[in-house]
Interface confidence: low
């Protein structure tokens, strides 16, 4: 099966754009937008810090660390109320991701 230009293979994602939005403090932040073509039972998520198609059950149960969102060597922890996750690098730097 041949893919047309701009068409994604099933189960894959691509980064589409860096968009701009503002948080409640009006500080400009960056947002990465991904375009995914996920198979049945999958949904767009994050694996190894890149957009990926993940098992939809992970999203429903908010077990974010099950989609392996952090880089190898980093530790993943769920935020309180399962509102997102943190990735902790070996050196201690922490990246927090919240799911809206």
């Amino acid at each position: 099966q041949f893919l047309k230009e701009g068409q994604l293979a099933a189960g894959t994602c691509e980064i589409v754009t860096l968009d701009r939005c503002c948080n409640k403090n009006r500080r400009t932040i960056a947002r990465q937008t991904a375009r995914c073509a996920c198979r049945k039972g999958q949904i767009a998520g994050t694996t190894r810090a890149r957009p990926a198609c993940v098992d939809a059950r992970i999203i429903k149960t908010k077990q974010w660390c099950d989609m392996l969102p952090c880089l190898e060597g980093e530790g993943c922890d769920l935020l309180i109320n399962r509102s997102g996750w943190t990735c902790t690098q070996p050196g201690g730097r922490i990246k927090t991701t919240t799911v809206s």
């Epitope: 691509e14 980064i15 589409v16 754009t17 860096l18 701009r20 400009t28 932040i29 960056a30 990465q32 375009r35 190894r48 810090a49 890149r50 880089l71 190898e72 060597g73 980093e74 690098q89 070996p90 050196g91 730097r93 990246k95």
Partner: antibody, heavy 121, light 112 residues
Amino acid sequence: QEQLVESGGRLVTPGTPLTLSCTASGFFLSGYYMSWVRQAPGKGLEWIGIIYPSGSTDYASWAKGRFTISKTSTTVDLKITTPTTEDTATYFCARVAGYVGYGYETFFDIWGPGTLVTVSL
Amino acid sequence: ELVMTQTPPSLSASVGETVRIRCLASEDIYSGISWYQQKPGKPPTLLIYGASNLESGVPPRFSGSGSGSDYTLTIGGVQAEDAATYYCLGGVTYSSTGTHLTFGAGTNVEIK
């Protein structure tokens, strides 16, 4: 302590391919995004390219076709495909901190001491 | 292609003075800037990341500010050991070409 060391720099004649290697201690290269940067004598820093844990790569526009970044289980390598005298420089490997793909979080937190490449007839 | 215009190319300051180095990106880089110090014969070291975050172990006299395409590294109360060349690094990501990073040309700081 987390450290990087480059090796492979030497005197080569123009057109002779050369491969540089970067090894890590204190952390596993395989789990990180890694970059190569170079600095010609008395000049500024130039970003060459980046390799992801998956092995996929991105390059500076000027570096495409001139360099190839690859990896093994223990090294990140930079091949200078067809060296010219303009490629004479110190080559650094650097670990990328944060998440590549989110441009505002892309930075280098660990650098190797560099390895000198001299391209001369 | 991203261009980072760094000014001034060089400056001379006395101990205790405040030094400011500016980097202007050719487009909005969403705070995607980091700052590095390099001394002769040594690799660069990270000072600031994400425009304003101080790297651990870096003296608090170093600070970063800015947004959009305009960013500044400030050394408040410069010390003799701050004599070095300073570089900014800007980064953006495009869907078509992936990650692209560009260094500024550098600023050589001399302490009188």
